[in-house]
Interface confidence: medium
């Protein structure tokens, strides 16, 4: 197979440490202009499976503030604006990367961590278990 | 005042370069047991705003594979299983952190990047603009 040549301008890394620890540039390239989930859309209010956004805050993590969706109802909102319990509001989850300081109190040493967050809710047909 | 002492095991940093670059340990602490979005739930099929999951792959990014949701319909699925265009299927988006190799093809040098991904879809009441 074809191997992409290693860029000669790469920082050095000793095999014994690679790839456990890498250098990361903090000049974050942000492809998005709006980072506030409440501003980005009002889907959380207009959805047939509406949700509330709760602030999950941890000063020892980056990002320190993560918004977690909690579905407002067990059922879904029908055309009359009432909750229909024949349908279910369920959270849509996403696994995201965060950075946590490690070892503690080191200003420039971090570990990647994966956490599961609920981003919003969707309305699904329930799985019905029929008893014989 | 009292300063938290700097951990003696911290990586060194020269003031002129610090804090643009930090060390990140890639031994990811994963708080989740299930990482495959197709396995984690079948909501994408059971939703009234169903979606398909598309594989977005980039070897110069970590994680190299990200699953992107694309809503199947403009409308939502009604109780009869038909698409109701009086409602809208819309993507729920989440801003996530990724690592991008920089310079390209360097195995241990990255830049933090924020990208917006569609995680799933939800069914919303449309905003109707009335013409006078």
């Amino acid at each position: 197979g074809i191997t992409i040549p290693r860029n000669p301008g790469c920082p050095n890394s000793e095999d014994k440490n690679f790839p456990r620890t890498v250098m990361v540039n903090l000049n974050i390239h942000n492809r998005n202009t709006n980072t506030n989930p409440k501003r980005s859309s009002d889907y959380y209010n207009r959805s047939t499976s509406p949700w509330n956004l709760h602030r999950n805050e941890d000063p020892e993590r980056y990002p320190s503030v993560i918004w977690e969706a909690k579905c407002r109802h067990l059922g879904c909102i029908n055309a009359d604006g009432n909750v229909d319990y024949h349908m279910n509001s369920v959270p849509i989850q996403q696994e995201i990367l965060v950075l946590r300081r490690e070892p503690p109190h080191c200003p420039n040493s971090f570990r990647l961590e994966k956490i599961l967050v609920s981003v919003g809710c969707t309305c699904v047909t329930p799985i019905v278990h029929h008893v014989a | 005042g009292i300063t938290i002492p700097r951990n003696p095991g911290c990586p060194n940093s020269e003031d002129k370069n610090f804090p643009r670059t930090v060390m990140v340990n890639l031994n990811i602490h994963n708080r989740n047991t299930n990482t495959n979005p197709k396995r984690s739930s079948d909501y994408y099929n059971r939703s009234t705003s169903p979606w398909n999951l598309h594989r977005n792959e980039d070897p110069e990014r970590y994680p190299s594979v990200i699953w992107e949701a694309k809503c199947r319909h403009l409308g939502c699925i009604n109780a009869d299983g038909n698409v109701d265009y009086h409602m809208n299927s819309v993507p729920i988006q989440q801003e996530i952190l990724v690592l991008r190799r920089e310079p390209p093809h360097c195995p241990n040098s990255f830049r933090l990047e924020k990208i917006l991904v569609s995680v799933g879809c939800t069914c919303v009441t449309p905003i109707v603009h009335h013409v006078a």
């Epitope: 805050e57 980056y62 971090f110 | 804090p19």
Partner: nanobody
Framework: EVQLVESGGGLVQPGGSLRLSCAAS????????MYWVRQAPGKGLEWVAE????????YYVSDVKGRFTISRDNAKNSLYLQMNSLRAEDTAVYYC????????????WGQGTLVTVSS
């Protein structure tokens, strides 16, 4: 939603003083380091001062040390910058910023307050 609102800027003569304030909301103010950063006309952003969550530790960029004092009131969710012996080169838009564990990386800024030092 995280909000930072600065005030207190204005026109001042060289050698004069100003006190900038920043009102914070939408996060647990007392848990985070806070910063003042500035942008002089036609220049890039420059870090000015940092204060740790308890207020007991402060850091300053070398050219403001001894002239500027950063402080905070966690009960009022407020950050301050006392600026004395102001110089023409201190002319800039001053922003307060919420700290993150990533050193000198800010996700949230205020809208800024303009400080003009001129005779």
């Amino acid at each position: 939603e995280v909000q930072l609102v600065e005030s207190g800027g204005g026109l001042v003569q060289p050698g004069g003083s100003l006190r900038l304030s920043c009102a914070a909301s939408g996060f647990t103010f007392s848990s985070y380091s806070m910063y003042w950063v500035r942008q002089a006309p036609g220049k890039g952003l420059e870090w000015v001062a940092e204060i740790k969550p308890t207020g007991s530790v402060q850091y300053y960029v070398s050219d403001v040390k001894g002239r500027f004092t950063i402080s905070r009131d966690n009960a009022k969710n407020s950050l301050y910058l006392q600026m004395n012996s102001l110089r023409a080169e201190d002319t800039a838009v001053y922003y307060c910023a919420k700290g993150e564990i990533l050193p000198l990386y800010f996700d949230y800024w205020g809208q800024g307050t303009l400080v003009t030092v001129s005779s």
